[in-house]
């Protein structure tokens, strides 16, 4: 009997989709209503629980007990501003349970509360059942997708939802990455191409730039907004028609949840119509207080209502291009993903931005993510089909990862948007003479100073044999695996003694909003940060040079090679500089550099005289460019250039 297939699930904010790779191709599986996408809705009634189309179809009758948008809650704390903001727009109740949000509904006559993971697991169960009905056998293995900027807690919660649904989650992958796989399968053997994936779905917006080359996918940059999508366009229509109803009938329907819900359903239908027609009609019988609401809207008016939202989609496009260090002319292909990319105005804005470049619409935008997830599931299950066997997926680290060095400086070992899995090693040293240990403090973020970044974890490497500052060699390795799990190891090269920390999904990491905020702030403060980074770098260069010179002339091996007068000259100047440094830690870069040059002017001629013809370091051989590093609690570590 053939091995059971693994499925790919696009667990969307508003709609979900499931696919399977078999017989060398992907099948997107239709549900029992014949729909290839299924609403991410769960409804609770007096008699039953409904999932998918059945749940969404009765939403107007049962708004308080019909749950959607679980993806906006999953992995978040109740106090999260996003949760607090979203709650205002939901007809169902969200309660606080130990700072975890829970959805409270009435089910079979009882009040029940469910975690977002449970709601999502119900949708996943539905998707699993859709696949099983099609395949004819039980399915357990699955790849599930999440937005690119989901943080670890959101990813872990999604994985938990899969487990609750009885799935073995092979991997959580980014939606744009999955879409890239779907696109790339059709594109192997065409040489390296830069592809921009524009994914505008029901609830999230992701822009990704990938390089696709002979089946190898590399994510170069991701940007987006987890709070922009088709629902926002629906809201604009709803608001427009609420105002129209007020004008026509002098009545405000906005506080009547059932009326708003029915209006929203009609608006969503009208929006879809406007993608293929220039006008759409709405006919809602007895919308409010017995009043029938018959109206229409033109595509032009819809575009005007949403113009700022549509235009705002270009900002992440520009940002992704900046991050990928690409000009728009260097993008070979533009790929549309997500149902909202069917909107003609969205397509036109994107096409105009890229100077009339054709948009690739070959992939059904609603199905691309599930398609790619299905391919990835097949790869992880060891499918040997020639369509997938050469496919390699390279994901990225959304934020730079590094450690704190002398002066509180963020020294990044893995840069933001680096392809993962990845491993980076760097040599560091001690900051003080006879320092017995170093404190390795691991951070993520884009700011110059660690205080402005997010601490992921810390550990100490102790037992360093007594030695002058700068002598011990501590090898630090950052290793991220394909699942985004980070291992940081520090090894004292002289003793082989090592210590490590593993930073996994269960450590509270940053939310998408925090990541976005940090990236935006990092851009906003880039100039400021650069000044600060340069200032600390100049300070450390001076400090390092002063200590190096001091220890150089005090070296017993130099006895008789350096005159007492020269030795005194160097030591006096080093003493002057070291004391000045102690009193002027907040001096400007120019001041540190001036002092370093002054010290070099005294020391270089004397030191170089000692090494001429000896094959040792020549002028400035001790390195004016010192560590780039910082203070913090515990022993400090310095970067070695």
């Amino acid at each position: 009997m053939a091995k059971a297939a693994a499925i790919g699930i696009d667990l969307g904010t508003t709609y979900s989709c499931v696919g399977v790779f078999q017989h060398g191709k992907v099948e997107i599986i239709a549900n029992d209503q014949g729909n290839r996408t299924t609403p991410s809705y769960v409804a609770f009634t007096d008699t039953e629980r409904l999932i998918g189309d059945a749940a969404k179809n009765q939403v107007a009758l049962n708004p308080q007990n019909t749950v959607f948008d679980a993806k906006r809650l999953i992995g978040r704390k109740f106090g999260d501003p996003v949760v607090q903001s979203d709650m205002k727009h939901w007809p169902f109740q969200v309660i606080n349970d130990g700072d975890k949000p829970k959805v409270q509904v009435s089910y079979k006559g009882e009040t029940k509360a469910f975690y977002p993971e449970e709601i999502s697991s119900m949708v996943l169960t539905k998707m699993k059942e859709i696949a099983e009905a099609y395949l004819g056998y039980p399915v357990t293995n699955a790849v599930i997708t999440v937005p690119a900027y989901f943080n670890d807690s959101q990813r872990q919660a999604t994985k938990d939802a899969g487990v609750i649904a009885g799935l073995n989650v092979l991997r959580i992958i980014n939606e744009p990455t999955a879409a890239a796989i779907a696109y790339g399968l059709d594109r192997t053997g065409k040489g390296e191409r830069n592809v921009l994936i524009f994914d505008l779905g029901g609830g999230t917006f992701d822009v990704s730039i990938l390089t696709i080359d002979d089946g190898i996918f590399e994510v170069k940059a991701t940007a987006g907004d987890t709070h922009l999508g088709g629902e926002d366009f629906d809201n604009r229509l709803v608001n427009h028609f609420v105002e129209e109803f007020k004008r026509k009938h002098k009545k405000d329907i906005s506080q009547n949840k059932r009326a708003v819900r029915r209006l929203r359903t009609a608006c969503e239908r009208a929006k879809r119509t406007l993608s293929s027609s220039t006008q759409a009609s709405l006919e809602i019988d007895s919308l409010f207080e017995g009043i029938d609401f018959y109206t229409s809207i033109t595509r032009a008016r819809f575009e005007e209502l949403c113009s700022d939202l549509f235009r705002s989609t270009l900002e992440p496009v520009e940002k992704a291009l900046r991050d990928a260090k690409l000009d728009k002319a260097q993008i070979h292909d533009l790929v549309l993903v997500g149902g909202s990319t069917r909107i003609p105005k969205v397509q036109k804005l994107l096409q105009d931005f890229f100077n009339g470049r054709d948009l690739n619409k070959s992939i059904n935008p609603d199905e691309a993510v599930a398609y790619g997830a299905a391919v990835q599931a097949a790869i992880l299950m060891g499918d040997k089909s020639e369509n997938v066997q050469d496919l390699l997926l390279l994901d990225v680290a959304p934020l730079s990862l590094g450690l704190e060095t002398a002066g509180g400086v963020m020294t990044a070992l893995i840069k933001r948007n680096s392809t993962i899995p990845t491993k980076q090693t760097q040599i560091f040293t001690t900051y003080s003479d006879n320092q017995p240990g170093v404190l390795i403090q691991v951070y993520e973020g884009e700011r110059a100073m660690t205080k402005d970044n997010n601490l992921l974890g810390r550990f100490e490497l102790s037992g360093i044999p007594p030695a002058p500052r700068g002598v011990p060699q501590i090898e630090v390795t950052f290793d991220i695996d394909a699942n985004g799990i980070l291992n940081v190891t520090a090894t004292d090269k002289s003793t082989g003694k090592a210590n490590k920390i593993t930073i996994t999904n269960d450590k509270g990491r940053l939310s998408k909003e925090e990541i976005e905020r940090m990236v935006q702030e990092a851009e906003k403060y880039k100039a400021e940060d650069e000044v600060q980074r340069e200032r600390v770098s100049a300070k450390n260069a001076l400090e390092s040079y002063a200590f190096n010179m001091k220890s150089a002339v005090e070296d017993e091996g130099l006895k008789g090679k350096i005159s007492e007068a020269d030795k005194k000259k160097v030591l006096d100047k080093c003493q002057e500089v070291i004391s000045w440094l102690d009193a002027n830690t907040l001096a400007e870069k120019d001041e540190f550099e001036h002092k370093r040059k002054e010290l070099e002017q005294v020391c270089n001629p004397i030191i170089s005289g000692l090494y001429q013809g000896a094959g040792g370091p020549g002028p400035g051989g001790f390195g004016a460019q010192g560590p780039k590093g910082g203070s913090g609690s515990g022993p400090t570590i310095e970067e070695v250039d």
């Epitope: 006096d572 003493q575 002057e576 070291i578 004391s579 000045w580 102690d582 009193a583 002027n584 001096a587 120019d590 001041e591 001036h594 002092k595 040059k597 002054e598 070099e600 002017q601 270089n604 001629p605 002028p619 400035g620 004016a624």
Partner: antibody
Framework: QIQLVQSGAEVKKPGASVKVSCKAS????????MNWVRQAPGQGLEWMGW????????TYADDFKGRFTFTTDTSTSTAYMEVRSLRSDDTAVYFC?????????WGQGTLVTVSS | EIVLTQSPDSLAVSLGERATINCKSS????????????LAWYQQKAGQSPKLIIY???TRESGVPDRFSGSGSGTDFTLTIDSLQAEDVAVYYC????????FGGGTKVEIK
């Protein structure tokens, strides 16, 4: 004996450039920094910056960043100070001065006149 | 940037009398490690280049007569010419080298 000999007076038009030289003798040129000081007519001394004669790295005071360039030629033990895009307020005597623990030896000064 | 303020702007003293010039710094020039104040005094006679007379607040440059003395610490410094001679007529400048370099505005010393 230690001497710093500067190039002669210059008259330049606004927008032009001027390069003043300062030839050192009587000591090892690369062992001491060379400073540049400006003195406008009837005004006080203004420190312009200095150059590390060993590494060739210059340092400029804030008011002298941009149009001013310090260089050295160690083979001739000469320091240079160039001003580009001359303006009338650059009219001044420019001094070079060797630095040990202070500016212990000074050149005789070079008068640069900027006039249209 | 450290600002040095000299006072008075000009000073007329009889031959053989004492001349006192003050220099106030906007921040301390004392290096606690070396216990030195990084302040120097220069003399500039009319039409000549400046000449170093005192460095590190009170150390006389070689060849400078002992009637010149410097004192002070932190932010307040004084140059004293004990018995003014005709050849001492000049403009005197203080200069800090604690961080970068800055000159004071100068004090003109004349014979009364």
């Amino acid at each position: 004996q230690i001497q710093l000999v500067q190039s002669g007076a210059e008259v330049k038009k606004p927008g032009a450039s001027v390069k003043v030289s300062c030839k050192a003798s009587g000591y090892t040129f690369t062992n001491y920094g060379m400073n540049w000081v400006r003195q406008a007519p009837g005004q006080g001394l203004e420190w312009m910056g200095w150059i590390n004669t060993y590494t060739g790295e210059p340092t400029y005071a804030d008011d002298f960043k941009g149009r001013f360039t310090f260089t050295t030629d160690t083979s001739t033990s000469t320091a240079y100070m160039e001003v580009r895009s001359l303006r009338s307020d650059d009219t001044a005597v420019y001094f070079c001065a060797r630095y040990d623990h202070a500016m212990d030896y000074w050149g005789q000064g070079t008068l640069v006149t900027v006039s249209s | 940037e450290i600002v040095l303020t000299q006072s008075p702007d000009s000073l007329a003293v009889s031959l053989g009398e004492r001349a006192t010039i003050n220099c106030k710094s906007s921040q301390s020039l004392l290096n606690s490690g070396t216990r030195k104040n990084y302040l120097a005094w220069y003399q500039q006679k009319a039409g000549q280049s400046p000449k170093l007379i005192i460095y590190w607040t009170s150390t006389r440059e070689s060849g400078v007569p002992d009637r010149f003395s410097g004192s002070g610490s932190g932010t307040d410094f004084t140059l004293t010419i004990d018995s003014l001679q005709a050849e001492d007529v000049a403009v005197y400048y203080c200069k800090q080298s604690y961080t970068l370099y800055t000159f004071g505005g100068g004090t003109k010393v004349e014979i009364k």
